[in-house]
């Protein structure tokens, strides 16, 4: 004959644990209901009747099953520079994400803490690493030959432009300028090799770097252990 | 568009038991908690307890707690309470309704009439 | 159990008039919800988390109020507004619903 299932509560047999969505509950010494997620524990078990569970209320949340007499607050409500990606329901906390053109500077277990904007580089400075959700953009001067004159989170170091005759030679943060005879070929706008030297190539002159500007937050973050990259802005 | 659909008016006698049935469609079921609220004629709204079909688990109110009980069955995607010992103070319209996880019942069934009369 | 109060219970109004029904709570509420509903039909989701408007409902409507004291607008009352308007409170276990405040025109 099978074994008898026996119903919450049940005192166990000694050195046996409870079974799956139980627990013991070590004043009634004896294995009782866990709530479900959407629920908390609004009375506990006795040796005679079991777990009461009710519903979380307004803005709490329990995600997993549990015994808890209260469920927990959903987090605050999303910042300005945040965008929610997961409303706060009976089970599962709110989710708040940085908006396009933010970064997470303090993130927490789920979402973001603290959103900042991302680095934007000055004209002369192009982005040499991207920013991502977590990362802020990384700036470098850009180099001979190539020109960026945006002030721009996006914007990569561009060629310039080969001229049959040069009117006004490129630098860092302009491109050069041809006389009225069209150039013999001009770079794709978002090309990233540069073309190798030519006689014609305009002379680049390199700008003295400048010092970086963090971001125009109302907070300071320790910046790590390496310097601010170069060519940034705050605006 | 999600649907609730219950099932006919009911006629008991004082003492009887009433189970009414509300079938959802368009949706996946045991994604939304199911809630039951009924309305006694010319009054207002009484939420008598919530079912969560994922887990089966159920929380009612204090004053019907041992007379109400709300069930599922996933497979036909159609929720069921069955009120016993029927009084003549639990006629009333009873309509399910879903709230999505979050505090306020956006899908309301067609309602049932329940009429305790002896 | 917290009760709501709605005021007033009945309102008559004109086209055009603009409306405000209370909601009072006994206790502190996060969020108030409205409901609407028209004699022989189920209530309608009307507003929730307290000023958001469900979908389909005029922009005519608003939602506002916080702690004990929630009120519904109706910026300019159209004839399709009569109905019965009930507030709604899930911040403390069982939720609860207002008396109902039954809107007339005039």
């Known amino acids: 004959l099978p074994a008898q299932v026996a119903f919450t509560p049940y005192a166990p047999e000694p050195g046996s644990t409870c079974r799956l969505r139980e627990y013991y509950d070590q004043t009634a010494q004896m294995c009782c209901s866990k709530c479900s997620p959407g629920q908390h524990a609004k009375v506990f078990c006795t040796k005679t009747s079991d777990t009461v569970c009710d519903s979380c209320e307004d803005s709490t949340y329990t995600q997993l099953w549990n015994w808890v007499p209260e469920c927990l607050s959903c987090g605050s409500r999303c910042s300005s520079d945040q965008v929610e990606t997961q409303a706060c329901t009976r089970e599962q906390n709110r989710i708040c994400t940085c908006r396009p053109g933010w970064y997470c500077a303090l993130s927490k277990q789920e979402g973001c803490r603290l959103c900042a904007p991302l680095r934007k580089c000055r004209p002369g400075f192009g982005v040499a690493r991207p920013g991502t959700e977590t990362s802020d953009v990384v700036c470098k001067p850009c180099a001979p030959g190539t020109f960026s004159n945006t002030t721009s989170s996006t914007d990569i170091c561009r060629p310039h432009q080969i001229c049959n005759v040069v009117a006004i030679p490129g630098n860092a943060s302009m491109d050069a300028v041809c006389t009225s005879t069209s150039p013999t070929r001009s770079m794709a706008p978002g090309a990233v090799h540069l073309p190798q030297p030519v006689s014609t190539r305009s002379q680049h002159t390199q700008p003295t770097p400048e010092p970086s500007t963090a971001p125009s937050t109302s907070f300071l973050l320790p910046m790590g252990p390496s310097p601010p990259a170069e060519g940034s802005t705050g605006d | 568009q999600v649907q609730l659909v219950q099932s006919g008016a009911e006629l008991k006698k004082p003492g009887a038991s009433v189970k009414v049935s509300c079938k959802a469609s368009s949706y996946s079921f045991t994604d939304y908690n199911m809630n039951w609220v009924r309305q006694a004629p010319g009054q207002s709204l009484e939420w008598m307890g919530i079912i969560f079909p994922k887990y089966g688990t159920t929380s009612y109110a204090q004053k019907l707690q041992g007379r109400v009980t709300l069930t599922t069955d996933t497979s036909t995607s159609t929720a069921y309470m069955e009120l016993r010992s029927l009084r003549s103070d639990d006629t009333a319209v009873y309509y399910c309704?879903?709230?999505?996880?979050?505090?306020?019942?956006?899908?309301w069934g067609t309602g049932t009439t329940v009429t305790v009369s002896s | 159990d917290i009760q709501l109060t709605q005021s007033p219970s009945f309102l008559s109004a004109s086209v055009g008039d603009r409306v405000t029904i209370t909601c009072r709570a006994s206790s502190s509420v996060t969020y108030m919800y409205w409901y609407q509903q028209k004699p022989g039909k189920a209530p309608k989701p009307w507003i929730y988390?307290?000023?958001n408007l469900a979908s389909g409902v005029p922009s005519r409507f608003s939602g506002s109020g916080s702690g004990t004291e929630y009120t519904l607008t109706i910026s300019s009352l159209q004839p399709e507004d009569a109905a019965t308007y009930y507030c709604?409170?899930?911040?403390?276990?069982?939720?609860?619903f207002g008396s109902g405040t039954k809107l007339e025109i005039k």
């Open positions: 988390l307290t000023s």
């Open positions: 709604q409170q899930w911040s403390s276990n069982p939720p609860t």
């Open positions: 309704a879903t709230d999505g996880g979050t505090w306020y019942f956006d899908v």
